[in-house]
């Protein structure tokens, strides 16, 4: 569906004459009819297949006509067709006179016909004007044309019917050629589908209108990302919904039993960081200068011989100090104020000079090693110590300092955790692969079972006839204060009957 | 089944403050979003603030920005809203709620709605 519109612009008819070349009386007064057809070679007289249209009387002889389509009136002349526009057309427009106000056909005198013009061709669909100007051998037309679609009827032939809606239906307005345009936060095949919130989980979350995130069930959050853990997970998440994945220290089905042994027993020594690796296992990291399972060992910082050029090193609280000796200084003893000159190659080494005598190397002997050669070559560089073992230079030789657990030369053997008897007051000592564990006796308790826990001794109520009983604290024993008139450690022979005994 | 119960509301004047409480039962509470929603008279339902599971993360509408505090105590199972600088149009029944659903600003659909505190910001 769409409409053929004709712009008239200008008619040219200088001598005021009809086609017989009569004049009209007074002047010509002109007005049109026009016939719209289907394409034919030879244009011939026959129905206006497209239709037709007249036009008032628009002037007399030669005159312009003026658009009139902003005042409502009739130029462009409209010609609609209900039909797709097959891209060509036959055009016939007649200018004829009218004598009188009646400008039906039936009304004018065969012989007022001004002039007649008939074109053919193709036409596209669009919002161009084509122009053109038809001249004869006493007239002149001017005008213009196009063919554009009705309202909601898109494409080259305005065959397409596109009506915008923003309803359950569809969102979505047309683009020229037709096809739909989604609103924004629209999409799909007919702009039924709202775009959820951006980011919005796929498969977890939805929507049902844009720029929202709704969540399946077992999930939440803004983007429904982030999974319910089981109902009564206590310190535990989860990857998918109502799992229970238990937080490092913690277990049982509802990760709700406490395995932080750190927080609980404070084993690490000396400031040292405290790390869970399961239940009742931990790992200490110890602060420079300690060592062992629990930071219990002070390191000396000197044992790695830091300073260099014969410095002496020295031990402090927080690290070490080096003492330089004559023409070395630095953090290390590193830097020298020598030359050659001060013979300060030790141990043999021989000196070179650099840099035009500013400073110098010296070349050291096999075993000497040290910007001055005055460090013997450490034997510990080849770390020979095994088990983590320390390895520590002690003049000509070099000794291991083993790890607890661990002993022989190279602390190559393992000591049962057990062997050293950690357990205190007769406790049981179990050999763990992460430690070792203490079963203590009745009234002990701790790690090594070094706390004593009274037992009340009383508990049992040893003492007869009614007698007082007092704990011995220092012997976890009992005394009976006995009433009058009864004897025995335990208050149990009456005064004056002496005890049987079985010998 | 889930419980939530609010309280700590009243009436204050233009500039006062309130702290608001949510007591929540019947489920696991530190595994949930949970939100704060006010209805006025005559309104619709107003998302105010939200907070994730843990309490790491936390939401305001524009209207209440600088000015309210969601907060929440998992071992308590409560959820907590200070309002602080409060004005005439706070007037709301505020309620706890489990959202369900987010829009582009925050919560607009909820799993499980409390029956609200009445809030009067008055002189």
């Known amino acids: 569906s769409g409409v053929f519109q004709l712009q008239l612009q200008e008619f040219i008819n200088e001598r005021g004459v009809l086609a017989s070349g009569r004049p009209c009386e007074p002047g010509c007064r002109t007005f049109f009819r026009v016939c719209l057809k289907h394409f034919q070679a030879v244009v011939s007289p026959g129905p206006c297949t497209f239709g037709t249209v007249s036009t008032p009387v628009l002037g007399t002889n030669s005159f312009a006509v003026r658009d009139d389509s902003s005042g409502g009136g009739r130029n462009p002349l409209q010609l609609p067709f209900n039909f797709t526009w097959p891209g060509t057309f036959s055009l016939i427009i007649e200018a004829w006179h009218a004598p009188g106000d009646d400008l039906r056909p039936e009304a004018l005198p065969p012989d007022a016909l001004i002039s007649k013009i008939a074109i053919q061709g193709s036409l596209a669909v669009g919002q161009n004007w084509l122009l053109d100007e038809q001249t004869s051998t006493l007239t002149r037309l001017r005008y213009s044309y196009r063919v554009i679609c009705s309202d909601n009827y898109y494409g080259d032939n305005c065959s397409r019917l596109c009506k915008k809606r923003n309803d359950h239906f569809g969102h979505y307005v047309c683009q020229p050629d037709g096809n739909l345009s989604c609103l924004p936060g629209w999409t799909g095949e007919y702009c039924q589908q709202p775009i959820c919130l951006s980011g919005c989980h796929e498969q977890n979350g939805y929507c049902s209108k844009p720029a929202e995130c709704l969540c399946r069930p077992g999930w939440q959050g803004r983007l429904c990302n982030e999974c319910i853990p089981h109902n009564g997970c206590r310190h535990g998440t989860c990857s998918t919904p109502w799992q229970c994945t238990c937080d490092e220290g913690w277990g049982g089905l509802f990760c709700d039993q406490d395995l932080n042994y750190c927080t609980h027993h404070s084993p690490c020594k000396n400031g040292a960081t405290c790390s869970n690796s399961g239940q009742r296992s931990y790992t200490c990291t110890c602060r420079p200068g300690y060592t062992g399972v629990d930071c219990e060992l002070e390191l000396s910082e000197c044992d790695s011989n830091p300073c260099r050029n014969g410095g002496s090193c020295k031990d402090q609280e927080d690290g070490y100090h080096c003492l330089c000796p004559p023409g070395y200084y630095g953090l290390h003893c590193e830097h020298s104020t020598l030359s050659c000159a001060d013979s300060p190659c030790f141990n043999g080494g021989s000196c070179r000079e650099r840099n035009q005598g500013a400073n110098y190397a010296c070349e050291c002997p096999p075993n000497f090693t040290g910007s001055n050669c005055e460090k013997k070559v450490d034997r510990c560089t080849s770390n020979p110590c095994a088990n983590g073992g320390q390895c520590l230079n002690r003049g000509p030789s070099r000794m291991c300092r083993c790890r607890p657990g661990f002993t022989g030369t190279y602390c190559e053997l393992h000591v049962s955790d057990c062997a050293r008897n950690p357990c205190a007051h007769g406790g049981t000592c179990h050999d763990l692969e992460n430690g070792l564990m203490c079963t203590c006796p009745a009234g002990f308790s701790g790690r090594r079972c070094e706390v004593r826990t009274s037992i009340d001794a009383c508990a049992s109520s040893p003492c007869f006839n009614r007698a007082t009983c007092y704990t011995d604290l220092s012997t976890d024993t009992f005394v009976c204060n006995c009433p009058y008139g009864f004897v025995g450690s335990r208050c149990e022979f009456p005064v004056g009957l002496p005890p049987s005994f079985p010998w | 089944e889930v419980q939530l119960v609010e309280s700590g509301g009243g009436l204050v004047q233009p500039g006062g403050s309130l702290r608001l409480s949510c007591a929540a039962s019947g489920f696991t509470f530190g595994s949930y979003d949970m939100s704060w929603v006010r209805q006025a008279p005559g309104k619709g339902p107003e998302w105010v603030s939200a907070i994730n599971s843990g309490g790491g993360s936390t939401y305001y509408a524009d209207s209440v920005k600088g000015r309210f505090t969601i907060s929440r105590d998992n071992a308590k199972n409560t959820l907590y809203l200070q309002m602080n600088n409060l004005k005439p149009e706070d007037t709301a029944v505020y309620s706890c709620?489990?959202?369900?659903?987010?829009?582009?600003?925050?919560?607009?659909?909820?799993?499980?709605w409390g029956q609200g505190t009445q809030v009067t910001v008055s002189s």
């Open positions: 709620a489990i959202p369900r659903g987010w829009g582009p600003t925050g919560p607009h659909e909820y799993a499980y």
